[in-house]
């Protein structure tokens, strides 16, 4: 899913207030819902009919530093006999997410949001058939 | 996938620099990669063997204001005949993502990152069989 562009009013103060300095805002360092629970089924990446592998990218100047990307293992899907069926398609499910980028200039540290496209997993679909002719 | 807790050093300046005021940092208002392209297949939510619906939540004090959540349509998966097969399971694929929360106190505006758990889509899996003793 695609994150829309940030509205120009999002970083502004209410109309009745003095304007904010252009270009930067105050970011509180805590994170809301930091202890939130992900309740994904066990090993769905290997049990799926469109299985996938994970690779991890690491960047110490990004939060989260670790971003995990899925790659579909097959072109087709795994059928009930455990064989690949290429009349179906394993396709990636992608999600735009935000990360926080840390920027250093000498002793000045600032932060900026960054959009990252994450492949979260794969699903098995009936392909769009463009009939021969 | 779960986002780890933010390390206590992430918001700190380099050791040789004077310490930063406790609790807040400078956030640049631009967004890196704002025009990034999501290349999801057409209508995969309806073409999947584990199809899903989308619902949208809206919050004007959050960026992105719109967060889309998927819900699997079925307990089972759709077979080659278009019928639900409950020997397989449609399961949600979840992803922890960050959003930016805007907080007002009078004319003071600050921002804080918030973790949100998003169900991005569904995949069809072989169920974990718990054998009857």
């Amino acid at each position: 899913r695609k994150i829309p562009k940030v509205g120009h009013t999002f970083f502004q103060k209410p109309e009745s207030c003095p304007p904010v300095p252009e270009g930067s805002m105050k970011l509180d360092t805590g994170i809301i819902n930091e202890n939130q629970r992900v309740s994904m089924s066990r090993n769905i990446e290997s049990r799926s009919t469109s299985p996938w592998n994970y690779t991890v990218t690491w960047d110490p100047n990004r939060y989260p530093s670790e971003v995990v990307q899925a790659q579909c293992k097959h072109l087709g899907c795994i059928n009930a006999q455990g064989k690949e069926d290429i009349s179906m398609n394993s396709v990636p499910i992608q999600q735009e997410t935000l990360v926080l980028r840390r920027k250093h200039q000498g002793c000045s540290v600032s932060f900026q949001l960054e959009k990252v496209l994450v492949t979260v997993g794969c699903t098995c679909v009936t392909p769009v058939v463009h009939h021969v002719q | 996938r779960k986002i780890p807790k933010v390390g206590h050093t992430f918001f700190q300046k380099p050791e040789s620099c004077p310490p930063v005021p406790e609790g807040s940092m400078k956030l640049d208002t631009g967004i890196i990669n704002e025009n990034q392209r999501v290349s999801m297949s057409r209508n995969i939510e309806s073409r999947s063997t584990s199809p899903w619906n989308y619902t949208v939540t809206w919050d004007p004090n959050r960026y992105p204001s719109e967060v889309v959540q998927a819900q699997c349509k079925h307990l089972g998966c759709i077979n080659a005949q278009g019928k639900e097969d409950i020997s397989m399971n449609s399961v949600p694929i979840q992803q922890e993502t960050l959003v930016l929360r805007r907080k007002h106190q009078g004319c003071s505006v600050s921002f804080q990152l918030e973790k949100v758990l998003v169900t991005v889509g569904c995949t069809c899996v072989t169920p974990v069989v718990h054998h009857v003793q």
């Epitope: 579909c72 072109l75 690949e84 009349s87 769009v128 463009h130 | 005949q81």
Partner: antibody, heavy 118, light 112 residues
Framework: QFQLVQSGAEVKKPGASVKVSCKAS????????LNWVRQAPGKGLEWMGV????????SYNQKFKDRVTMTVDTSTSTVYMELSSLRSEDTAVYYC???????????WGQGTLVTVSS | DIVMTQSPLSLSVTPGQPASISCRSS???????????LHWYLQKPGQPPQLLIY???NRFSGVPDRFSGSGSGTDFTLKISRVEAEDVGVYYC?????????FGQGTKLEIK
Amino acid sequence: QFQLVQSGAEVKKPGASVKVSCKASGYTFTDYNLNWVRQAPGKGLEWMGVIHPDYGTTSYNQKFKDRVTMTVDTSTSTVYMELSSLRSEDTAVYYCVRYDYGDAMDYWGQGTLVTVSS
Amino acid sequence: DIVMTQSPLSLSVTPGQPASISCRSSQSLVHSNGNTYLHWYLQKPGQPPQLLIYKVSNRFSGVPDRFSGSGSGTDFTLKISRVEAEDVGVYYCSQSTHVPLTFGQGTKLEIK
């Protein structure tokens, strides 16, 4: 008009690798799978594998699984087939072939002759 | 792997006469979705193969109606109602129901 244009003939030594390209035109490149099929001199057809140009996902014939790599460059509408650890029995014409799901291999490239000889 | 067996391996036909090629698969080619992914190709001398018939009996665009396909399960037939000189070459049956995709060994058609 649909076209699949392959790279030119190659002569390789045993143990080397070869990379054959196939440039597609005349249709929406990401809408169709592309297969690689080979034909040894005077012999029949042998399927090597298939790639989905949109995702780069592949399905390989187990016979070639450890030696073949299929890749895609969507910016140039080109797919590549690399075969490593070449032996004399890999001497063949290699075809890239468009594939419409479950229908059939409808359009074939002109073929690329790969000769493996010491 | 599915083995595709063609017969005869060669045939010589007088122009205007019919011809028939048989193809047998080692397993059923009926997919769980109900389709049968059995196809026929012709490779003319010095050319890449070309699609004639897809999914048992569907003629590809531009293929003359003297070519027809039939069969089900494991037994399939390609018929040419009246052979013409331009029909010479090697005919292959192929299946794409199961991975890996496989081809028959080919049937060489010559003109008498």
